[in-house]
């Protein structure tokens, strides 16, 4: 049998095989050692008994999407049946005081591989023997601790495979420089040691994506905005836009990155090298936000231009290649495969990423201020309580609710929260009356809200003893 007979039904074309050479991977045309590594079809009854106490689940994840040329990392985690775990020496043991369907186990081991390897090797002290090999016959690498690594992982994609000896989690990184753009399939088969052979215990597959577009996300934040995820924001207050580039392998670390913003409100283009920008919309309405991110990334050099004919001018050193694989064409001049030749054959490719969002701008409460506080004289029966009137003004739209949160002087431990609807005139002047139990210093957070906004002001107040001569003090605002 060959690797492709064992590992997957997806057969890439000859073109794909030739053009997707992965560094350190081998062709799946190689022979698979079925004596050491038996092959079971899906549904084979032997899967039922491949692991003591249940089935092992393999979870395959990746940090896809990957910008072409960057590294993509795949991680496989084995999930053992309940109450089982891997110990420090790579043996699979039952967790102490853990009860599964079979009850508490007397034997601490599910698989005691240490015992097997110590008495079954016959390796003349070299650690090498005919069974310490991968499915293609290559010997296991002799990392320190390799004897505690009891799982064999075979990764398979694009007509190639990669073998790795490991423990209950492994990770493999692949450079995507030669990978065709678009979605690809990664399949992983996992075997465990079984005496002098191996037994399959899990198979898993996952789709990953290689793209020539920089994966871009934008977070938006605005003070007083009630719901930051609904893309509705307030007029006359700055919105902070923060660009996050998905680049887990740090491929773009040494790239110059430019951000080109169009806010859709006729304020023109704004170009920056900073990943955060503030913008204030001064009109209500719906606006189309567009961002183009440009990064000069390391890339292959174009073929040298043909020698010039005497009658024509010398072609420029900047060569532009047409890209047929780009998912979303950028604006004019934003070709994803624009190459510039620089000395000593290190070249750069301009890569682009795009983000578009529709933003709705509405009126909101822009500001709230406490302009006055008055101690209201209480009738005699409540000598311990103080009634205080807060006179509050606001700017922007008219609030529909007011909340006060009274807490300790550090503003951390809430003592009392009261919310109530309010009916405010156009001048936006209102009086909020609150009770304070006892003298002392309090932190007062006062918020005015409507459907789309929530404006806050805070103050520390000092409530005196109930002595008419003691004035009420605003500690600071």
């Amino acid at each position: 049998k060959r690797f492709h007979d064992v590992l997957g039904n997806e057969r890439p074309s000859a073109y794909m095989r030739e053009h997707n050479q992965l560094n350190g991977w081998s062709s799946d045309e190689n022979d698979w050692n079925e004596k050491l590594y038996p092959v079971w079809k899906r549904g084979d009854m032997r899967w039922k008994n491949s692991w003591k106490g249940g089935r092992v689940q393999a979870v395959l994840t990746s940090d896809s999407p990957a910008l072409v040329g960057s590294n993509i990392t795949f991680a496989v985690n084995l999930i053992f049946p309940r109450c089982q775990k891997e110990d420090a020496n790579g043996n699979i043991v039952y967790e102490k005081n853990c009860r599964n369907e079979a009850g508490l186990s007397a034997d601490p081991y599910v698989y005691n591989w240490t015992a097997w390897s110590e008495d079954s090797d016959g390796e003349n002290g070299t650690g090498q023997s005919h069974h310490n090999v991968f499915p293609d016959g290559k010997p296991f690498p002799h990392h320190p601790g390799w004897r505690r690594w009891n799982f064999i992982y075979v990764f398979h994609t694009l007509g190639q495979y990669f073998q790795k000896l490991g423990r209950c989690s492994v990770r493999v990184s692949v450079n995507t420089a030669n990978v065709t753009l678009g979605p690809q399939l990664m399949e992983v088969t996992v075997y465990r040691r079984h005496g002098r052979a191996y037994v399959p215990i899990a198979q898993v597959k996952d789709v990953y994506v290689v793209t020539d577009q920089i994966p871009v996300f934008v977070t938006m934040f605005q003070k007083n905005d009630r719901n930051s995820s609904d893309e509705t924001f307030l007029k006359d207050l700055p919105i902070m836009f923060d660009v996050l580039i998905h680049d887990p392998s740090h491929f773009l670390n040494y790239s110059t990155i430019n951000y080109k913003w169009s806010f859709g409100d006729n304020t023109g283009l704004f170009v920056s090298t900073n990943h955060t920008v503030n913008h204030t919309y001064v009109l209500n309405g719906t606006f189309s936000l567009n961002l183009t991110v440009k990064a000069a990334a390391p890339g292959p050099c174009p073929p040298p231009p043909p020698p010039p004919r005497p009658s024509k001018p010398t072609p420029s050193l900047a060569t532009t290649l047409k890209s047929y694989d780009s998912n979303t064409p950028g604006p004019a001049g934003d070709n994803p495969l624009e190459l510039s030749r620089i000395p000593d054959e290190n070249c750069q490719i301009n890569r682009y990423g795009h983000f578009q969002a529709t933003i709705t701008i509405v009126e909101g409460i822009l500001e709230v201020n406490i302009i006055q506080m008055t101690d209201v004289l209480m009738p005699v029966p409540w000598p311990e309580s103080s009634l205080i009137d807060f006179v509050v003004t606001c700017q922007g739209s008219i609030p529909t609710e007011v909340c006060t949160i009274i807490s300790d002087p550090t503003c951390e431990i809430t003592q009392n929260t009261v919310c109530s609807p309010v009916d405010v005139d156009e001048m936006c002047l209102l009086t909020v009356r609150r009770t304070f139990n006892g003298s002392g210093t309090y932190c007062v957070n006062l918020t005015l809200g409507d459907d789309t906004s929530l404006a806050l002001t805070s103050t520390l107040i000092s409530v005196p003893d109930r002595d008419p001569a003691s004035p009420l003090r605003m500690a600071n605002s």
Epitope: N77, A88, N89, H143, P144, R147
Partner: antibody, heavy 121, light 104 residues
């Protein structure tokens, strides 16, 4: 260059807790197993705990099992050691040390400068 | 892991030998560290005999199974330190008790 910088040591009473941190730089932190090793004043080296490259598995010396917890945050390139129910015999300089391999099965190729933990009533 | 001697005193340019004995076969899974006074341990040798890069060639390691040796072929003043062996064939990882090397 590879750097490991420990912090969080100090004087603590028996039975109390302390959290040590180790900030890593100069290498791809998420590819390596990392250990805590301690050294009591004037004494030899003692291995304390190890955590795998991905944080999945953690192993401890019998002397600290159930009291100490090793953890890591790969996004912050930081290793932690939460030490609870501290005893007089836990007083030592605590080093974080990198294992050259992902599972922390082997030896220590880079060490931090250490942070001193004193347990005293 | 038993290290011997626990301390030694030798002259500059002397050949110095430190031994480390394991209670069971650990193949070649042994490392050696140097710790200078008031400093951090430093890896000298791993896999019993492989010199860590940057370590002077006067240091060498040998042995396999249960008996291991660290040799300093020509002792230098800067070699004053405590030397530790460490096994890593299986968990837990353990250190020898240390050998303190001084100059006569």
């Amino acid at each position: 260059q590879v750097q490991l910088v420990e912090s969080g040591g100090g004087v603590v009473q028996p039975g109390r807790s302390l959290r040590l941190s180790c900030a890593a730089s100069g290498f791809t932190f998420s590819n390596y197993g990392i250990h805590w090793v301690r050294q009591a004043p004037g004494k030899g080296l003692e291995w304390v705990a190890v955590i795998w490259f991905d944080g999945r598995n953690k192993y401890y010396a019998d002397s600290v099992k159930g009291r100490f917890t090793i953890s890591r945050d790969n996004s912050k390139n930081t290793l932690y050691l939460q030490m609870n129910s501290l005893r007089a015999e836990d007083a030592a300089v605590y080093y974080c040390a990198r294992d050259p391999f992902d599972y922390g099965d082997s030896f220590f190729d880079y060490w931090g400068q250490g942070t001193l933990v004193t347990v005293s009533s | 892991l038993t290290q011997s001697p626990s301390s030694l005193s030798a002259s500059v340019r002397d050949r110095v030998t430190i031994t480390c004995r394991a209670s069971q076969d650990i193949s070649n899974y042994l490392a050696w560290y140097q710790q200078k006074p008031g400093k951090v341990p430093n890896l000298l040798i791993y896999a019993a005999s492989t010199l860590q890069s940057g370590v002077p060639s006067r240091f060498s390691g040998s042995g396999s199974g249960t008996d291991f040796t660290l040799t300093i072929s020509s002792l230098q003043p800067e070699d004053v330190a405590t030397y530790y062996c460490q096994k890593y064939n299986s968990a837990p990882l353990t250190f020898g008790g240390g050998t303190k090397v001084e100059i006569k």
